[in-house]
């Protein structure tokens, strides 16, 4: 396993809809033709799985079903979105990229973005 | 010039298995998923899953879950969608597509189960 | 699963006509990729990222949308458009494509 460079920014405040978008960059030693993309969560000391997926030559990232992400990606950069988010969701978010194939394999750790979500005010009610 | 060639039609007993091969030519063979798909006589398009040839990651749609296993062979550049515990219902033609645009397509292998 | 809804089901037009195929997600996608499928044949790739033609495919197709709804157009309908359209969606697994349309000569 080798180590790999990925970039990814610092701080990130979500939409008021609970949307957050992020870059997430790899310095790849080589043409991977087989990539896989994690995003993880770190709140607490505890690390989980947001999201993953494998993509190839297409420049959109297909996740699982009921994925709270959509992707896309162009070159060695993938463009992600959580979607979903509520202020308890706050926290760091990691990008994990594996290149898969061709050997050899190499691992990529960012050091996270942390999004920050603030959940709506309720509108108040109106008098006409 | 990119072609995929598929393996022959076949006649299966229910309860059976098919292995269908999907050889591919005139391109990098592990830089592009093998995606299978399936259509019923008179039916639409129904995606069983896919291959990425280099790693041999797989995919599957959970209604094939099971019952369908995908491989493939570098060395030949082939690849192999495996459907097992066959019924009637699988009575289709079986289509191997490349790519994430599904931009090729074999002309399909033509599997009839049949008691 | 994300189910793709199009319509039409069956559309009868006539050469020269300007005719609009809908596909319709139940949820939000990324990308909608359409296919032409002729009988006898295997489908072939007409659009795909919603509004880029594939290699050799005629300017008188075009696609459009976003979210969950899309459309595909022919400008002016020829002889060799007359056959059955899919859509189909990757944003997530499985993978789904639409019921079909076909368009018949009227």
């Known amino acids: 396993c080798k180590a790999m460079h990925v970039a990814q920014p610092a701080v990130v405040l979500a939409s008021s809809r609970g949307i957050a978008s992020f870059v997430c960059e790899y310095a790849s030693p080589g043409k991977a033709t087989e990539v896989r993309v994690t995003v993880l969560r770190q709140a607490d000391s505890q690390v989980t799985e947001v999201c993953a997926a494998t993509y190839m030559m297409g420049n959109e990232l297909t996740f699982l079903d009921d994925s709270i992400c959509t992707g896309t990606s162009s070159g060695n950069q993938v463009n992600l979105t959580i979607q979903g988010l509520r202020a308890m969701d706050t926290g760091l978010y990691i990008c994990k990229v594996e290149l898969m194939y061709p050997p050899p394999y190499y691992l990529g750790i960012g050091n996270g973005t942390q999004i920050y979500v603030i959940d709506p005010e309720p509108c108040p009610d109106s008098d006409f | 010039q990119v072609h995929l060639v598929q393996s022959g039609a076949e006649v299966k007993k229910p309860g059976a298995s098919v292995k269908v091969s999907c050889k591919a030519s005139g391109y990098t063979f592990t830089s592009y998923w093998i995606n299978w798909v399936k259509q019923a006589p008179g039916q639409g398009l129904e995606w069983?899953?896919?291959?990425?040839?280099?790693?041999?990651?797989?995919y599957y749609n959970e209604m094939f879950t099971g019952r369908v296993t995908m491989t493939r062979d570098t060395s030949t550049s082939t690849a192999y969608m495996e459907l097992s515990s066959l019924r009637s219902e699988d009575t289709a033609v079986y289509y191997c597509?490349?790519?994430?645009?599904?931009?090729?397509w074999d002309q399909g292998t033509m599997v009839t189960v049949s008691s | 699963d994300i189910q793709l809804t199009q319509s039409p089901s069956f559309l009868s037009a006539s050469v020269g006509d300007r005719v609009t195929i809908t596909c319709s997600a139940s949820?939000?996608?990324?990308?909608i990729h359409w296919y032409q499928q002729k009988p006898g044949k295997a489908p072939k790739l007409l659009i795909y990222?919603?509004?880029t033609l594939a290699s050799g495919v005629p300017s008188r197709f075009s696609g459009s949308g976003s979210g969950p709804e899309y459309t595909l157009t022919i400008s002016s309908l020829q002889p060799e458009d007359f056959a059955t359209y899919y859509c189909?969606?990757?944003?997530?697994?499985?993978?789904?494509f639409g019921g079909g349309t076909k368009l018949e000569i009227k």
């Open positions: 069983m899953g896919r291959i990425a040839p280099g790693s041999g990651t797989t």
């Open positions: 597509a490349r790519g994430d645009y599904f931009d090729y």
């Open positions: 949820k939000s996608v990324s990308y």
């Open positions: 189909q969606q990757r944003t997530t697994y499985p993978l789904t």
């Open positions: 990222d919603t509004s």
